[in-house]
Interface confidence: low
């Protein structure tokens, strides 16, 4: 029959070439002379000329060694024609299968593989995977089947079999306990890949296993006892730097220290922070210490890490004895701000109040007093007793110095310590009103027509406080009542001035006396410009220029 079974040809054949593979034969050669030819990749198309056929005998020829890793199978077509060129058979499929030889070594995908694993992990923990490839056939033969093994381990501590590798997957795992970063931070394994499933050619690569830090070392105080001296009252004062050592990886959470004051700080006077670079514990005062209350504090500080311990570890504790140093403290006025009511206008030399300070220090220090700020210069202070007296006239209505009836004075106390210290107090004098001001009209100049004049409404003001103000009373004096009338309104806070008789155009003085609820009287002269006009006027019509 015009059929050829698949032909198997080993790669890398030694020849001699051309090498006869198989004979094409048509049974039509009984009837006529047959000529044979082949077509397809490897014959008449690239790679051309690998195969040929003897035209008259039909022998299929191989012209050169084959490479399975380049082309593993060729598909050709065989043709049979008669002498006159007529096709005597349909094209026949010829399959040539290239069989594998173990002509390639395994190759690792990297020269160096890097992996990492936490120190102290259990045996069986997977670390990393290495991969090697082999171009040979791993399906039909063992030529391309790679087996992995560990050739050597450096360093060989705590012993030389810390890791194992899965023969077929290349997964490296921990096989032994005892990984300790602080002793061996990195292992270098020489790994092998061998084809023929471990029986053939071998190649090597390096696997670097980084041992990652676990918090398996506790920080330890060095030293464990400290003595420090701190001046009283200092806030934010650095008391002491506590030093710890930790074998874990520097600058990692397993190394960075966390400090805690475990005892001795009942008043919450201290705080401790971690220095970001040195890892020291910086003990500082959160609030001022008081020598008089307690001159020594014994603190107990515990240190752990930012990361939790991975196993039970003892916690290191330090003892810090803090000696509080006495400081001459400033006298303190009691109260810091004192409010005193005093009547305005009291006689000079009259006592206002006694304002004294206390010294927090235990020694009986002498305190002297003086006025620090007295804007109007109204007061004096006895340096020994703290007695404040009036030396000027206290005036509630003085808007420059008095705000909302209050006159503010700052006083100073100084002790006789070495060096002396000072404290200040604020004296707030609430000035009680006295009826020392009479009512005053506004405005004090008016312009009015002498025919059908408009009534002039004047506002009444009094600097005093109620009840020394409205209701007011008005009275015209010095014959002003012949031409004018003055009436206070119902509310008692304005006075209405009216022209009751004709006056020629000119300027006149109207004598108006106003008195307040406390009968304090004030005489005011109103300048009245009378114009020749009717009703409302603001300025007299020309040509008159005024008097």
């Amino acid at each position: 029959d015009w059929v050829v079974a698949p032909i198997s040809v080993p790669e890398n054949g030694k020849g001699p070439f051309p090498q006869r593979l198989n004979q094409l034969k048509s049974n039509k050669d009984r009837d006529t002379k047959i000529f044979y030819s082949i077509t397809g990749p490897g014959a008449d198309s690239p790679p051309e000329g690998v195969f040929a056929v003897e035209k008259e005998t039909g022998w299929l020829l191989l012209n050169k060694p084959l490479d399975r890793e380049e082309i593993a199978k060729y598909e050709l077509f065989g043709h049979a024609v008669s002498e006159n060129g007529a096709s005597v058979e349909d094209p026949m499929n010829i399959s040539i299968i290239v069989t594998d030889q173990n002509d390639h070594k395994p190759k690792f995908t990297q020269d160096t593989f890097r992996g990492s694993v936490l120190e102290g992990v259990m045996p069986g923990t997977s670390v990393m995977q290495v991969t090697a490839t082999d171009e040979d056939d791993a399906v039909n033969t063992y030529n391309g089947v790679v087996a992995y093994s560990i050739h050597s381990q450096e360093p060989k501590e705590p012993h030389d079999l810390m890791f194992t590798i899965h023969k077929s997957t290349g997964t490296i795992s921990v096989i032994s306990s005892g990984l300790d970063r602080e002793k061996v931070p990195e292992y270098r394994l020489t790994v092998q890949a061998t084809d023929m499933d471990g029986e053939g050619s071998t190649t090597t690569a390096e696997a670097v296993v980084q041992i990652l830090d676990a918090n398996d070392n506790a920080p330890e105080f060095d030293p464990q006892k400290y003595e420090a001296h701190v001046p009283e009252n200092a806030v934010g004062h650095e008391v002491q730097r506590l030093t710890v050592t930790d074998l874990d990886a520097p600058n990692s959470p397993a190394w960075r220290a966390t400090y805690l004051i475990m005892g001795g700080d009942d008043g919450d006077h201290f705080t401790i922070t971690t220095h970001p670079e040195s890892n020291q514990g910086i003990l500082t005062t959160r609030k001022g210490l008081d020598f008089e209350a307690k001159n020594q504090h014994t603190l107990y500080v515990e240190v752990t890490n930012e990361a939790p311990f991975v196993l039970k570890l003892p916690t290191s504790t330090a003892t810090i004895v803090v000696h509080v140093e006495d400081v001459n403290e400033a006298p303190v006025f009691v109260p810091p701000s004192k409010v005193v009511e005093v009547q305005e206008g009291i006689p000079t030399g009259e006592p206002v109040c006694v304002y004294t300070a206390e010294d927090p220090d235990k020694e009986n220090q002498k305190i002297s007093y003086r006025i620090l700020r007295d804007p109007a210069g109204w007061l004096a202070m006895d340096p020994d007793s703290g007695q404040v007296t009036a030396v000027g006239t206290l005036d509630r209505e003085d808007e420059q110095f008095v705000r909302n009836n209050i006159y503010e004075v700052m006083v100073l106390a100084m002790d006789n310590g070495s060096p002396p210290t000072t404290g200040t107090g604020t004296l707030l004098l609430t000035l009680i009103d006295v009826n020392d001001h009479g009512p005053v009209p506004e405005p004090r100049q008016i312009t009015i027509c002498n025919q059908s004049p408009v009534r002039q409404v004047l506002n009444i003001t009094d600097k005093d406080l109620s009840p020394h103000t409205s209701p007011f009373q008005a009275q015209l004096t010095d014959d002003s009542d012949i031409y004018w009338t003055a009436e206070v309104n119902e509310e008692g806070d304005t006075v209405v001035l009216s022209l009751k008789k004709f006056l020629k155009q000119d300027t006149y003085d109207v004598h108006l006396s106003l008195s307040d609820h406390g009968n304090k009287e004030q005489l005011t002269v109103i300048r009245a410009t009378v114009c020749d006009c009717h009703g409302h006027v603001e300025t007299c019509p020309g040509p008159w220029k005024g008097g």
Partner: antibody, heavy 118, light 107 residues
Framework: VQLVEESGGDLVKPGGSLKLSCAAS????????MSWVRQTPDKRLEWVAT????????YYPDSVKGRFTISRDNAKNTLYLQMSSLKSEDTAMYYC???????????WGQGTTVTVSS | ELQMTQSPSSLSASLGERVSLTCRAS??????LNWLQQKPDGTIKRLIY???SLDSGVPKRFSGSRSGSDYSLTISSLESEDFGDYYC?????????FGAGTKLEIK
């Protein structure tokens, strides 16, 4: 092959700001601390900043503290250096390098040039 | 700040020659020291870490050692690709500090 590649260097005026980037590949970026190191025109190398593998901790010398900020995006395998209030003495070639505890500066980039001049 | 004093600042040597570079630490840094090589194109490569551990892919002619506060990098037999700038860097104390560098040239 372990690769780190810096970018973002430029000419900037004194007092100005600049952000450098460093793209990493070929190693497990998220398990490595990373650093910036600079080389001044007189060829001196100077450490600039270090950041921990998770990005939670960062460290600086006094010369850049408060002006430079190191950060990282482990999802993008990228390291950054934000520089502000730049001075003429910050002119340098800036390199990024791995900072694995106990074994720092294993992998280095090619560098990116920063020039601070008016 | 911890100082790293590197010497010599430059060195001219012949192929095949044995050369040593030194860094002196002003304070104790334990074994926390690296040696770096910089080529003329600016490329930086780590040769040695932790005083004496050789980096992967670095030829065995390079070695690192320590004597007290002096740290040395030795090249047993110079080859043409060894020329360039060499720096030490300490990471045992913050801030991290570098030596001023040694320029290694062909004689």
């Amino acid at each position: 092959v372990q690769l780190v590649e810096e970018s973002g260097g430029d000419l900037v005026k004194p007092g100005g700001s600049l952000k450098l980037s460093c793209a990493a590949s070929g190693f497990t970026f998220s398990t490595y601390g990373m650093s910036w190191v600079r080389q001044t025109p007189d060829k001196r190398l100077e450490w600039v900043a270090t950041i921990s593998s998770g990005g939670h901790y960062s460290y600086y010398p006094d010369s850049v503290k408060g002006r430079f900020t190191i950060s990282r995006d482990n999802a993008k395998n990228t390291l950054y250096l934000q520089m502000s209030s730049l001075k003429s003495e910050d002119t340098a070639m800036y390199y990024c390098a791995s900072y694995y505890y106990g074994s720092p500066f294993a992998y280095w980039g090619q560098g990116t040039t920063v020039t601070v001049s008016s | 700040e911890l100082q790293m004093t590197q010497s010599p600042s430059s060195l001219s040597a012949s192929l095949g020659e044995r050369v040593s570079l030194t860094c002196r630490a002003s304070q104790d840094i334990g074994s926390s020291l690296n040696w770096l090589q910089q080529k003329p194109d600016g490329t930086i490569k780590r040769l040695i870490y932790d005083t004496s551990s050789l980096d992967s892919g670095v030829p065995k002619r390079f070695s690192g050692s320590r004597s007290g506060s002096d740290y040395s990098l030795t090249i047993s037999s110079l080859e043409s690709e060894d020329f360039g700038d060499y720096y030490c860097v300490q990471y045992g104390s913050s801030p991290l500090t570098f030596g001023a560098g040694t320029k290694l040239e062909i004689k």
